[in-house]
């Protein structure tokens, strides 16, 4: 059977978008009107992995782009990354580890905690403009908390 | 009054290691992010390195990458720069910066010169 | 990464002049454009972020426009104090860059 996916746009807890910065990239900043348009798409899959009540093992890909987000090791530490895929055989029920991300559903917030390195989380800073990173700490100064905006097809 | 002050610098050989050092003053240390620029002597400016708030985000140039690490200890209202494997292109004024709005630098430190030479 | 194409890379001027300094990204940079003036021997100060807003403190003979790849600084009525290096820089995406920067001398 086809991976079930959706259409999405995230938010994180202060109300920043999410939008492209580089090729390989994500940033976070408040954005109005027009500017809206900017912000990325992600296609949601729901994929393999251990599964509760609030929590949803789910791949992040951006929409009609093959990229998806995925968290490798970079100098001894777990680094969130865009990486670029064969759209033949993505996405797929079976994602490798570093692609998944456990969604936590909290007091209608969502956390995604990285499936490879557990306890580690999307993350995005309070600052304006500065990139999307995969952060080891929760309740901190950097934001783990978002929300999600469905998308039609 | 917002003040940045770099120490550290010096006199090195290729493949050496130095610290560099900036305390911050007149501001809340904590919350901002903050930068690494370097100019060589009659050049112009070249970002280097860029820390988050709480240390968990950093980034940096390509031509210092794998040699470099920028750090800050929040307790001591200081950020560092440790340079290793030095070459004879990384001489130059090191200034640490503290980020404004969007990813400007609004705020700099004085330098502190790096000179790698045999 | 992107490019950040300053011009002229010099230019004399007198007193008085007004003056206009343009700074190209290789590519869509919005309006995160700052600009820095840097005398000899002193550390670069900011002068303009977001492409058009003027930092606390700046003279408002400072002022810049534009976005997207094509940006503008100008000096409206230059002052002995203003013959300086001045740089653009990008903060759309890392790592960051500066332009040329354009050196401003007496004529």
């Known amino acids: 059977a086809p991976v079930r996916s959706l259409n999405c746009t995230l938010r994180d807890s202060q109300q920043k978008s999410l939008v492209m910065s580089g090729p390989y990239e994500l940033k976070a900043l408040h954005l109005q009107g027009q500017d809206m348009e900017q912000q990325v798409v992600f296609s949601m899959s729901f994929v393999q992995g251990e599964e509760s009540n609030d929590k949803i093992p789910v791949a992040l890909g951006l929409k009609e782009k093959n990229l998806y987000l995925s968290c490798v090791l970079k100098d001894d530490k777990p680094t969130l990354q865009l990486e670029s895929v064969d759209p033949k055989n993505y996405p797929k029920k079976k994602m490798e580890k570093r692609f998944v991300f456990n969604k936590i559903e909290i007091n209608n917030k969502l956390e995604f905690e990285s499936a490879q390195f557990p306890n580690w989380y999307i993350s995005t800073s309070q600052a304006e403009n500065m990139p999307v990173f995969l952060g080891g700490t929760k309740g901190g100064q950097d934001i783990t908390d978002f929300t999600m905006q469905f998308v039609s097809s | 009054e917002v003040q940045l002050l770099e120490s550290g610098g010096g006199l090195v050989q290729p493949g050496g290691s130095l610290r560099l050092s900036c305390a911050a003053s007149g501001f809340t240390f904590s919350k901002y992010f903050m930068f690494w620029v370097r100019q060589a002597p009659g050049k112009g400016l070249e970002w280097v390195s860029v820390?988050?708030?709480?240390?968990?985000?950093?980034r940096y140039a390509d031509s210092v990458k794998g040699r470099f690490t920028i750090s800050r200890d929040n307790s001591k209202n200081t950020l560092y720069l440790q340079m290793n494997s030095l070459r004879a292109e990384d001489t130059a004024v090191y200034y640490c910066a503290r980020v404004g709005y969007g990813g400007n630098s609004d705020y700099w430190g004085q330098g502190t010169l790096v000179t790698v030479s045999s | 990464d992107i490019q950040m194409t300053q011009s002229p890379s010099s230019v004399s001027a007198s007193v008085g002049d007004r003056l206009t300094i343009i700074c190209r990204a290789s590519?869509?940079?919005?309006?995160?454009l700052a600009w820095y003036q840097q005398t000899p021997g002193n550390a670069p100060k900011l002068l303009i972020h977001s492409a058009t807003s003027l930092q606390s403190g700046v003279p408002s003979r400072f002022s810049g426009s534009g976005s997207g790849t094509d940006f503008t600084l100008t000096i409206n009525s230059l002052q002995p104090e203003d013959f300086a290096t001045y740089y653009c820089?990008?903060?759309?995406?890392?790592?960051?860059?500066f332009g040329g920067g354009t050196k401003v001398e007496i004529k």
């Open positions: 820089q990008q903060a759309d995406s890392f790592p960051l860059t």
């Open positions: 820390i988050s708030p709480s240390g968990q985000m950093t």
């Open positions: 590519q869509d940079i919005n309006r995160w």
